[in-house]
């Protein structure tokens, strides 16, 4: 029968030793057994469980010429990059005949400098704004005490006496560095150094100061920027139609914004080259040497209507007896608003001017009072919006109507029964 089949007689002549070290350690556990006959396969146990995918070796050396003589078997188990999960009790196990033999245990322990599970991260914060930093370390050995440092200066008299996992900073007025030291019985480990960059606070109270059809004057109140003066502020404006959906928190508009920079102070800016009678959304951010603040929420604004920038086009005026036919086309120049209608003025030599509101029609027939012999009759037309009248056209003389000349379809506009060339009647 193979050696070691009696329960009281173990085949193991060398048992696993102990390994204690820091994270990352590479170590080897060994066991040796002497058996008679065919050498068995050696298995490794950790805390009583077989390690299925162990990185192991096995050497078998015969002690005699005959296969039935004794063999020395050496098994080695590699622990690569020691972690907490590798710690525990290790044993070798062999099956010999109908019996199972287990070696004496060896122990693998983790003991070294503290190991960081969480370290402070770089971040940006607004001036004088509270924030938290996190740091977490573990042994073994425990306990692990933390000591926070700001700009390399300890924030407590000794490790474990100040804040531990979370450091609450009520606010900063200058860019600072933070790190934490983890102390245990083995020594000290220092975390990475986090840079906390102090940016200006978000500007407040963005509002309109004045409105013109093509420009808006806006102002805002700057936020605190710590020890760093503001270098400039940036204003963005974007066209907004009703369906655009810029909400208070929506990060970016769907189209390229118009961007303007403002020297500061004053915290005011005139935005020009805008479209009249158009809704916009505007926002502002201010910058110091450390970087820009966050943007304000989008503020909806609207440019007011302006007057049309040009007169109606292609005015023609013809006269046939006591009737005058006048027609025109919409101004080619921008209307700067919603066209509400046209005003027409006509005047004869040495007679007062007559003003009429034609509405949105682009033609009119005038019933002239009297014998129609008034000389040098001229007509002017202007377009208007809610903001007022645009420029008048140049005077157009009434030409005599010639047979065969097309006459526009029109609706007669008769002057009321008042003397010819009366003052406006609208």
């Amino acid at each position: 029968a193979p050696r070691g089949t009696q329960a009281e007689e173990s085949p193991f002549v060398g048992n696993p030793g102990n390994i204690t070290g820091a994270r990352g350690l590479t170590g080897t556990l060994r066991c040796q057994l002497q058996v008679q006959g065919e050498p068995p396969e050696v298995h490794w146990l950790r805390d009583g469980q077989i390690l299925e995918l162990a990185d192991s070796t096995q050497t078998q050396v015969p002690l005699g010429e005959d296969e039935q003589d004794d063999w020395i078997v050496v098994s080695q188990l590699r622990i690569t990059s020691l972690q907490l999960s590798d710690t525990g009790q290790y044993q070798c196990l062999v099956f010999l005949g109908h019996q199972t033999f287990v070696s004496q245990p060896g122990y693998v322990g983790l003991e070294g400098l503290p190991y960081f599970l969480e370290e402070p991260e770089d971040r940006t914060v607004a001036a004088n704004t509270p924030f938290n930093l996190s740091c977490q370390a573990q042994g073994p050995p425990e306990p692990v005490d933390l000591l926070w440092l700001q700009d390399a200066v300890p924030l407590a008299t000794a490790p474990g006496h100040g804040p531990q996992r979370s450091l609450h900073v009520p606010g900063l007025n200058k860019t600072s560095s933070f790190s934490c030291e983890a102390h245990n019985a083995k020594g000290v480990t220092t975390s990475r150094t986090a840079t906390i960059t102090v940016l200006p606070q978000q500007p407040r109270n963005l509002h309109l100061v004045s409105r013109q059809p093509t420009e808006l004057e806006v102002a805002w109140t700057p936020g605190l920027s710590g020890i760093y003066p503001l270098t400039h502020c940036t204003l963005q404006a974007v066209l907004s139609d009703d369906g655009m959906g810029i909400q208070a928190g929506e990060p970016d508009p769907p189209e390229e914004p118009l961007t303007s920079q403002a020297s500061v102070p004053p915290h005011q800016l005139r935005l020009g080259s805008l479209h009249p009678h158009t809704p916009y959304h505007i926002r502002v951010a201010c910058t110091s040497s450390q970087g820009p603040s966050s943007w304000t929420h989008w503020l909806p604004v609207e440019t007011p209507e302006g007057v049309p920038l040009g007169p109606p086009e292609n005015i023609s005026a013809t006269r046939n007896g006591s009737q005058a036919f006048v027609h025109w086309q919409e101004p080619r120049a921008p209307l700067q608003g919603t066209l509400l209608g046209y005003r027409l003025a006509y005047q004869g030599q040495d007679t007062p001017e007559v003003l009429m509101d034609i509405g949105l029609r682009q033609e009119v027939t005038l019933e002239l009072q009297g014998d129609g012999s008034v000389s040098n009759l001229t007509v002017c037309v202007a377009a208007y919006t809610a903001a007022g009248d645009g420029p008048w056209s140049l005077p157009v003389p009434l030409e005599a109507w010639r047979p065969g000349q097309a006459q526009p379809v029109h609706q007669l506009v008769k002057e009321p029964s008042t003397p010819a060339f009366s003052w406006p009647w609208w």
């Epitope: 590479t26 192991s56 070796t57 096995q58 050497t59 590699r78």
Partner: antibody, heavy 121, light 107 residues
Framework: EVQLVESGGGLVQPGGSLRLSCAAS????????IHWVRQAPGKGLEWVGW????????YYADSVKGRFTISADTSKNTAYLQMNSLRAEDTAVYYC??????????????????WGQGTLV | DIQMTQSPSSLSASVGDRVTITCRAS??????VAWYQQKPGKAPKLLIY???FLYSGVPSRFSGSGSGTDFTLTISSLQPEDFATYYC?????????FGQGTKVEIK
């Protein structure tokens, strides 16, 4: 007598593949770890990876992970280094080496006591 | 990865001189340090393992010492066959890493 003999080196284009062999004799092939170490021309030594031929458990350096594969055939007492997606910076003499087995119930670390003659890639 | 920094990178010495090469680890590696000798066109040879243990067949003029982060290889009386490049190697953590080498030349 312990011996390790590498073969399979040669000239290869970037992106190409090559398989190196390391034939072992004179010791228990399953009783240790076989390491691959390389040395770029005029430079120092760089570890590539290891394998325990017994458990066929490889471990790699980050610089070759995903491109190189280490394997072993215990019936031939041979370890292999399959190199794919080769780069100019992989140019080196490649050595296989036997890990020196310390004694006692445990040890930390290891050393390499027998080395092959090297093969140039 | 642990960095191993050897100094000096080269030195000139005469036969019979006592030569000391140092190796510094970027973190504690206990005694998991080996020293190798390499001659041009040849494979490295193991001299010292576990920081201070002389490998079988290596002349006793070679010795190693140190633990933690600072290690030393000493050749008590330099011989003509000792002119070579020497490397330290840590194996405390994976990957094992080597020093950049120290070339010992004839003065």
């Amino acid at each position: 007598e312990v011996q390790l003999v590498e073969s399979g080196g040669g000239l290869v284009q970037p992106g190409g593949s090559l398989r190196l062999s390391c034939a072992a004799s004179g010791f228990s092939f399953t009783g240790t770890w076989i390491h691959w170490v390389r040395q770029a021309p005029g430079k120092g030594l760089e570890w590539v990876g290891w394998i325990a031929p017994y458990s066929r458990h490889p471990y790699y350096a980050d610089s070759v992970k995903g491109r190189f594969t280490i394997s072993a055939d215990t019936s031939k007492n041979t370890a292999y280094l399959q190199m794919n997606s080769l780069r100019a910076e992989d140019t080196a003499v490649y050595y296989c080496a036997r890990e020196y087995s310390g004694w006692g119930g445990s040890s930390v670390g290891y050393a390499m006591d027998y080395w092959g003659q090297g093969t140039l890639v | 990865d642990i960095q191993m920094t050897q100094s000096p990178s080269s030195l000139s010495a005469s036969v019979g001189d006592r030569v000391t090469i140092t190796c510094r680890a970027s973190q504690d590696v206990s005694t998991a340090v080996a020293w190798y000798q390499q001659k041009p066109g040849k494979a490295p040879k193991l001299l010292i393992y576990s920081a201070s243990f002389l490998y079988s067949g290596v002349p006793s003029r070679f010795s190693g010492s140190g633990s933690g982060t600072d290690f030393t290889l000493t050749i008590s009386s330099l011989q003509p066959e000792d002119f070579a490049t020497y490397y330290c190697q840590q194996s405390y953590t994976t990957p094992p890493t080597f020093g950049q080498g120290t070339k010992v030349e004839i003065k």
